[in-house]
Amino acid sequence: HNTTVFQGVAGQSLQVSCPYDSMKHWGRRKAWCRQLGEKGPCQRVVSTHNLWLLSFLRRWNGSTAITDDTLGGTLTITLRNLQPHDAGLYQCQSLHGSEADTLRKVLVEVLADPLDHRDAGDLWFPGESESFEDAHVEHSISRSLLEGEIPFPPTS
């Protein structure tokens, strides 16, 4: 599997999409896991609804949400309030029995918030009638890792 890079801005939300063959993975629940080291296990962060028919319902674990468009074949993961410690290698998985097939390997990169060093006077605050949710822009810049690039720094 190639690794796709998704970049998000610290403090904002990042949306990761994992396309898949909807017929090949029909009836299978999905999961989002974090790779622990280059050869280590993938630790489950969140999985779709226990009933596959309800996979469209968004499920949260802390600040991470997952939802599955089983007809269109797109698994979507939202990382809310992105933090530097969220950076790393993840996988979108398709579950069958106790096994998991990798749908996509994802490298999450967290960019510094450009507003961090500005004066408070320069910051924009929503008015009373506006909600953060409505005003909120989700950044999701993705690319594939170039050949030779490695998602983990080499261990000494």
């Epitope: 063959d21 017929m23 090949k24 029909w26 028919l53 029995g97």
Partner: antibody, heavy 123, light 107 residues
Framework: EVQLVQSGAEVKKPGESLKISCKGS????????IAWVRQMPGKGLEWMGT????????RYSPSFQGQVTISADKSISTAYLQWSSLKASDTAMYFC????????????????WGQGTLVTVSS | DIQMTQSPSSVSASVGDRVTITCRAS??????LAWYQQKPGKAPKLLIY???WLQNGVPSRFSGSGSGTDFTLTISSLQPEDFATYFC?????????FGQGTKLEIK
């Protein structure tokens, strides 16, 4: 009506090659995994491997990896099981089976089976 | 690999009897288990999947139960057409594995 029709019985000599087939009809062949299962004379069932005809993604049992090749041609709704060099111990009945995922528990079960192909390997 | 062990290996019973066949997995497989019936010279037929779900067209005298490592197939009232060999199969992980079979014979 879902049907899996397998090719006829084969009698071969050790060292010969062989390719048997399993043709699906009555459903979208490319969209369901197809498994191959061996049954040696008077014995139980052994899962050999499985293929997704849509993209030819294949999984093998470690016991059969390197011994057989599983392939499929979705354009003619047919899966294949082949040997490059048969042994007397390959004498068995071979079944293909459709693997259907049950959405309630996200695992798959063999809901339709071919009639079987008897392969006899003898000098 | 997960080993599946069936007991008994064979059982003799009469029409109308209630028969129970057990299947034990070498490790927990949740409810990822199927039961098949095979008659001589024929392909296996799916009876039960997900441990307790009856396949379409299978008579209701067949039932399955269990989870984890221990499973049972019960035929509540044997009919003449039920004399056959029964196999359990785990759908938890690759490679898929079957029990060695239980032959149900007429007493």
């Amino acid at each position: 009506e879902v049907q899996l029709v397998q090719s006829g019985a084969e009698v071969k000599k050790p060292g010969e090659s062989l390719k048997i087939s399993c043709k699906g009809s009555g459903y979208s062949f490319a969209s369901y995994w197809i498994a191959w299962v061996r049954q040696m004379p008077g014995k139980g069932l052994e899962w050999m491997g499985t293929i997704y005809p849509g993209d030819s993604d294949t999984r093998y049992s470690p016991s059969f990896q390197g011994q057989v090749t599983i392939s499929a041609d979705k354009s003619i709704s047919t899966a294949y099981l082949q040997w490059s060099s048969l042994k007397a111990s390959d004498t068995a009945m071979y079944f293909c089976a459709r693997s259907r995922t049950f959405y309630y528990d996200s695992s798959d079960y063999f809901d339709y089976w071919g009639q079987g192909t008897l392969v006899t390997v003898s000098s | 690999d997960i080993q599946m062990t069936q007991s008994p290996s064979s059982v003799s019973a009469s029409v109308g009897d209630r028969v129970t066949i057990t299947c034990r997995a070498s490790q927990g497989i949740s409810s990822w288990l199927a039961w098949y019936q095979q008659k001589p010279g024929k392909a296996p037929k799916l009876l039960i999947y997900a441990a307790s779900w009856l396949q379409n067209g299978v008579p209701s005298r067949f039932s399955g139960s269990g989870s984890g490592t221990d499973f049972t197939l019960t035929i509540s009232s044997l009919q003449p057409e039920d004399f056959a060999t029964y196999f359990c199969q785990q759908a938890d992980s690759y490679p898929r594995t079957f029990g060695q079979g239980t032959k149900l014979e007429i007493k």
